[in-house]
C-alpha cells in the first residue's frame, strides 16, 4: 500500500500591529505538537493595511471596519477554513494610540471599541484589542528576535542561520524605532538595573534573564520631527524656517495647528505671529544633527548613567538587532551592510542630505514625496539617537545589526506578543527535547 501523508497538524495565530503610521497584520504558523519548542513558530504572511494608523480614524471611527477588511479577508484566504475558529486574533496598538489616549481617553476607547466590534465579525477567535505599554513593546521585540535567532534553545548549533548570529547563547539586545516611540531592550552585564521601572525578570526555557528596557514616547521618527520643527520655529524670525534636515531646494508649508496637534510638541508650544510657515531645506547634516541633539536633555541624570531626559541606561552589552524604522530607513539609504563603519555612514548621510531636492525626486520617482523628503532627517535622527542618545560609539557600531527579517519572520514585537499570550514560551525547558539532526532511530 502507498504511504499517505498524514494531514498537517498545524496551528495559526494572527497579530495586528496598530502602529502610529500604519497597521500590519501578521499570520503565524507552527506544528501543533511542537508548541513549546523554541524556534518553531514562523510568519507565513504580512498584510500591510492600506491607509494610515488607526488613531487617524478618530473623526470617522465608523470606517475602521472598512479599513481593516482587505487584510482580514486575506487572513481568511491564507488560513484553511477548518482552522479559522481555532485561530486567535490579537490587536496591539502602540505609541500612536498612547498619544491619542493622553489627549482623550474617551476617544482612544471609542477607536478601540470599534476595532473590537469590527474584528469580532470575522470567523476567528478574537482575543481583544488593547494599547500595549512601551515596556511590553520593548520586551516582546526582544523576545521575538532572540526566539528567531535561537538564543533560547539549550543546544548550541554548529551552523549559523543568519550571517550575524554568534554561536554563543548570549542574547541580542533589541532596538526598535517606530513613528511615535523608540525602545531599547537588552540584558546588561552583571549590572543592577538602578531604576525599577526599567527592569524585567523573565524565566524562559529554564533560564533567568534580567532585562533592561525603556520606551521613549515622542521619540519615534515622525514625532521627533514634529518636536524638532516646534523647537526650531520658536526662534525663527519670520514664517520661513530654513531647515538643515531637508534637501536644498525643498519647500513645504506647515500649518501651526498641525504642529501643535500632538502632545509631543506641547513643551515647545508658543503663540506665533503666523498660522503657517514654510520649511526651506538647506541640506546640512552637521547642522541637522546639532538641532536633533537639542531634543535630548542630557543635563540631568539621577543615576550612574543615563540615556537622555533623566532615563537610566546601563552600559551597552553585546550585539543588538535594530529593526522596524531603524531597518527601513537605513535600507532605503543603503546603509544596512555589516561592513559599513559608523564614520562611513555619517559620510554618506552628509552627501545624501546635501543632494538637491530636484535631483532626489528624479532619482526616486516611485517614492511618495512626503516620505522621500524625510529620509535625510530620519537617517540623521537614527545616528543621533544611537550615538548620543544610547551612547553607541564608532567601535560599538559594529555590534548593531540592522534587521528586517530573521528566517522569513519580521523582527518586531508581534511574534513575542503572540508567543506570550498563547503560552508558547515555557518557563522551564520542555522535558522531551526533539531529536537532533544526527540522531536516527
Amino acid at each position: 500500500t502507498q504511504n499517505k501523508a498524514l494531514p498537517e497538524n498545524v496551528k495559526y495565530g494572527i497579530v495586528l500591529d496598530a502602529g502610529s503610521s500604519h497597521t500590519s497584520l501578521y499570520i503565524y504558523k507552527w506544528p501543533a505538537e511542537k508548541e513549546n519548542d523554541t524556534g518553531v513558530v514562523h510568519q507565513v504572511e504580512e498584510c500591510r493595511v492600506k491607509g494610515p494608523g488607526i488613531s487617524k480614524f478618530v473623526q470617522k471611527v465608523n470606517e475602521i471596519g472598512i479599513y481593516l477588511t482587505d487584510c482580514m479577508e486575506r487572513a481568511r484566504e491564507v488560513i484553511p477554513a477548518a482552522k479559522h475558529h481555532a485561530t486567535p486574533v490579537y490587536l496591539g496598538a502602540t505609541a500612536g494610540m498612547r498619544l491619542l489616549r493622553m489627549e482623550s481617553e474617551e476617544l482612544a476607547d471609542r477607536v478601540l471599541d470599534v476595532v473590537e466590534r469590527s474584528l469580532s465579525n470575522y470567523p476567528f477567535d478574537f482575543q481583544g484589542a488593547r494599547i500595549i505599554t512601551g515596556q511590553e513593546e520593548g520586551a516582546y521585540g526582544w523576545i521575538t528576535i532572540n526566539y528567531l535567532l535561537g538564543k533560547f534553545s539549550q543546544k548550541t548549533r554548529w551552523f549559523s542561520i543568519v550571517p550575524y548570529e554568534t554561536n554563543n547563547q548570549e542574547t541580542f539586545g533589541a532596538l526598535d524605532l517606530g513613528g511615535a516611540s523608540t525602545q531599547v531592550t537588552f540584558v546588561p552585564q552583571n549590572q543592577t538595573i538602578e531604576s525599577p521601572d526599567n527592569a524585567l525578570q523573565f524565566r524562559l526555557y529554564g533560564k533567568d534573564y534580567n532585562v533592561y528596557t525603556h520606551s521613549f514616547l515622542c521619540y519615534g521618527k515622525d514625532q521627533a520631527l514634529w518636536q524638532k520643527l516646534a523647537k526650531d520655529i520658536q526662534v525663527a524670525s519670520n514664517e520661513i524656517l530654513r531647515d538643515p534636515c531637508f534637501h536644498p531646494g525643498y519647500k513645504k508649508v506647515v500649518n501651526v495647528s498641525d504642529l501643535y496637534k500632538t502632545p509631543c510638541t506641547k513643551r515647545f508650544e508658543m503663540t506665533l505671529p503666523f498660522q503657517q510657515f514654510e520649511i526651506q531645506g538647506i541640506g546640512n547634516y552637521q547642522q541637522c544633527h546639532q538641532s536633533i541633539l537639542e531634543l535630548f536633555n542630557t543635563s540631568y541624570c539621577p543615576y550612574s548613567q543615563c540615556a537622555f531626559n533623566g532615563i537610566f541606561l546601563p552600559p551597552l552589552q553585546g550585539d543588538f538587532g535594530a529593526f522596524s524604522a531603524f531597518y527601513f530607513v537605513m535600507k532605503f539609504l543603503n546603509l544596512t551592510s555589516e561592513k559599513v563603519s559608523q564614520e562611513k555612514v555619517t559620510e554618506m548621510m552628509k552627501k545624501f542630505c546635501a543632494q538637491p531636492w530636484e535631483e532626489i525626486k528624479t532619482s526616486y520617482a516611485g517614492v511618495k514625496e512626503k516620505y522621500l523628503s524625510e529620509y535625510c532627517f530620519s537617517g540623521t535622527y537614527i545616528l543621533s539617537l544611537l550615538l548620543q542618545g544610547y551612547h553607541f560609539t564608532a567601535d560599538s557600531w559594529e555590534h548593531i545589526h540592522f534587521i528586517g527579517k530573521i528566517q522569513g519572520s519580521d523582527a518586531g514585537w508581534t511574534l513575542g506578543y503572540m508567543l506570550n499570550l498563547t503560552n508558547m514560551i515555557p518557563a522551564e525547558q520542555p522535558l522531551s527535547t526533539p531529536l537532533s539532526h544526527s540522531t536516527y532511530v
Epitope: 503610521s21 492600506k50 491607509g51 494610515p52 487617524k56 477588511t69 469590527s118 470575522y122 511618495k368 514625496e369
Partner: antibody
Framework: EVQLQQSGAELVKPGASVKLSCIVS????????INWVKQRPEQGLEWIGR????????KYDPKFQGKATMTSDTSSNTAYLHLSSLTSDDSAVYYC???????????????WGQGTTLTVSS | DIVLTQSPASLAVSLGQRATISCRAS??????????MNWFQQKPGQPPKLLIY???NQGSGVPARFSGSGSGTDFSLNILPMEEVDAAMYFC?????????FGGGTKLEIK
C-alpha cells in the same frame, strides 16, 4: 499629486497579445491596490481584477482568467495588464485605477488612468 | 456572481431638484457589518470617479449634495440639489465578493 499614466492606444491583430502599462506617480505603488476595468464602446464597466503590488497577490473575475494577467514592478512604480489571444470582443478602453484610504490621513479617494484604447482588428 | 440591477436606465431631473438612482443586488452585499456598495460617476471621454463608498461614505472631495443609503440588497444614490455638472452616467459597484461587479448604469440628464 497622485497620477496614473497609461500607455497609448494599441491596434493589434486577432490572436496576438498586448501588454498595457500604468505608471503611478505621487505615491508608492506598494501602498495601494491597482484595479483594472474594461469598458466597451457605449457599454458599462467590467472589473477585470485587482493586484496588491506589495506582494503580487491578485484577484480576478473568473471570466478574465486566462485572458488577462496583472503584474507590477515596484522599482518603476508601474502596473501592467497583459491580454492574450485577442479577439474583437477585447476591443475596449482599459482603465487602471486605485481607490482606498490615503496613507497619511483617513481620506478615501480614487485616481484613474486616462484609459488605453485597444482595437483588435485584422 | 452578484448581479446589480440599476433603475431607471435613464432619468431627467430639473436643476435644483432631487435625483434618485436605485441599485438592487441579487444577494446581500453586507458583510462584517459593512455594506460593500460603491457609486461612480462617469462623463463622456473621461474615466469614472468615485462618489460614495461603503454605501454611505463620501469620497474625498465629493460635494455634499451626493449621498448614498441602503443596506443588504437595496441601495440608492441621491443628488440634491441637481446641478448642471451632474449630468453623467452613474454606476453602482459591489466589492463584497469576487468577481466585483458593476450595475448597467443610469444616464442622468437635465430636464
Amino acid at each position: 499629486e497622485v497620477q496614473l499614466q497609461q500607455s497609448g492606444a494599441e491596434l493589434v491583430k486577432p490572436g496576438a497579445s498586448v501588454k498595457l502599462s500604468c505608471i503611478v506617480s505621487g505615491f508608492n505603488i506598494k501602498d495601494t491596490y491597482i484595479n483594472w476595468v474594461k469598458q466597451r464602446p457605449e457599454q458599462g464597466l467590467e472589473w477585470i481584477g485587482r493586484i496588491d503590488p506589495a506582494n503580487g497577490n491578485t484577484k480576478y473575475d473568473p471570466k478574465f482568467q486566462g485572458k488577462a494577467t496583472m503584474t507590477s514592478d515596484t522599482s518603476s512604480n508601474t502596473a501592467y495588464l497583459h491580454l492574450s489571444s485577442l479577439t474583437s470582443d477585447d476591443s475596449a478602453v482599459y482603465y487602471c485605477a486605485r481607490w482606498g484610504y490615503d496613507d497619511e490621513e483617513a481620506d478615501y479617494f480614487d485616481s484613474w488612468g486616462q484609459g488605453t484604447t485597444l482595437t483588435v482588428s485584422s | 456572481d452578484i448581479v446589480l440591477t440599476q433603475s431607471p436606465a435613464s432619468l431627467a431631473v430639473s436643476l435644483g431638484q432631487r435625483a434618485t438612482i436605485s441599485c438592487r443586488a441579487s444577494e446581500s452585499v453586507d458583510n462584517y457589518g459593512i455594506s460593500f456598495m460603491n457609486w461612480f460617476q462617469q462623463k463622456p471621454g473621461q474615466p469614472p470617479k468615485l462618489l460614495i463608498y461603503a454605501a454611505s461614505n463620501q469620497g474625498s472631495g465629493v460635494p455634499a449634495r451626493f449621498s448614498g443609503s441602503g443596506s443588504g440588497t437595496d441601495f440608492s444614490l441621491n443628488i440634491l440639489p441637481m446641478e448642471e455638472v451632474d449630468a453623467a452616467m452613474y454606476f453602482c459597484h459591489q466589492s463584497k465578493e469576487v468577481p466585483w461587479t458593476f450595475g448597467g448604469g443610469t444616464k442622468l440628464e437635465i430636464k
